[in-house]
């Protein structure tokens, strides 16, 4: 496939309260179950409808979970990670990495490799500049009428 797929990588702290149906999401990954090549991290594979995570709205399928209640999820067996979530208590703090796909060239898919991202300002600055130019041109056009 031609073109390069880049990602905007942002991190967020998400505090969930375990609801009547639990935290309400599934995970994949771990040292014994790599979801992304060369990455044994823990990823969200499914969010349960009307569960705590879905109602909160911030956690997304494909997000990488970096820590649970301050405990790092690096180099964990899959089941050890599962147990960590299950025993995390009523109030659960998640450090999460979101990856927003930024398309360069032909349309691709959300890849399972290359976790590299680009800084948010590299996208926002040109967008802001274009918006300002468009607004200026529009005002000039209206003045000429």
């Amino acid at each position: 496939m031609n073109g390069r797929v880049d990602y905007l990588v942002t991190e967020e702290e998400i505090n969930l309260t375990r609801g009547p149906s639990g935290l309400g999401f599934n995970i994949v990954g771990g040292t014994d179950q790599q979801y992304v090549s060369n990455d044994s991290g823990i990823y969200v594979s499914r969010i349960k409808e009307n569960g705590a995570a879905a109602l909160d709205g911030r956690l997304q399928e494909g997000d990488k979970i970096l820590s649970v209640n301050g405990q790092d999820l690096k180099n964990l067996l899959h089941q050890d990670a599962v147990d960590l979530f299950r025993n995390a208590g009523y109030a659960v703090s998640l450090r999460v990495q979101h990856r927003l796909q930024v398309q360069n060239g032909p349309i691709g898919h959300r890849g399972e490799g290359d976790p590299s991202g680009i800084p948010i300002f590299m996208v926002l600055v040109p967008v802001f500049a274009l918006t300002m130019v468009a607004a200026w041109a529009f005002m000039r056009y209206r003045q000429q009428l």
Epitope: R18, P20, S21, G22, L23, G24, F25, N26, I27, V28, D32, Q33, Y35, V44, S45, R46, K48, E49, N50, H78, Q79, V82, F85, R86
Partner: nanobody
Framework: QVQLVESGGGLVQAGGSLRLSCAAS????????MGWFRQAPGLERDFVAE????????GYADSVKGRFTISRDNAKNTVYLQMNSLKPQDTAVYYC?????????????????????WGQGTQVTVS
């Protein structure tokens, strides 16, 4: 997509045994949590048992603990439910189910909303 086909149901006398099988096609069951549910006429679909992707962790409904055993063979892409000491109240249509990943909650919380892929069911009747 994952396609699931159950087999092994039938008519059995109280106290007897049955072994249900669920064969998956379309995708390997690695990374999938597998479960069994059952539905009696006019009632909701209830959780019976589930097994983690590796087979290392299992969970059961209180009503079947000590009588039913769930297992899996990832090489054969198949999940099993061994049912012993069957009771008339075990009569139902039994469904196999699959979902990607591992739920971050214990199976006490489990409902049909936790699973995405379903078989067509196999009837179990205990007389």
């Amino acid at each position: 997509q994952v396609q699931l086909v159950e087999s092994g149901g039938g008519l059995v006398q109280a106290g007897g045994s049955l072994r249900l099988s669920c064969a998956a096609s379309g995708r390997t069951l690695m990374r999938y949590t597998m479960g069994w549910f059952r539905q009696a006429p006019g009632l909701e679909r209830d959780f019976v048992a589930e097994i983690s992707w590796s087979g290392g962790n299992t969970g059961y409904a209180d009503s079947v603990k000590g009588r039913f055993t769930i297992s899996r063979d990832n090489a054969k892409n198949t999940v099993y439910l061994q049912m012993n000491s069957l009771k008339p109240q075990d009569t139902a249509v039994y469904y196999c189910a699959a979902v990607i990943g591992s739920p971050t909650d214990y199976s006490d919380y489990r409902s049909s909303l936790d699973y995405d892929y379903w078989g067509q069911g196999t009837q179990v009747t205990v007389s």
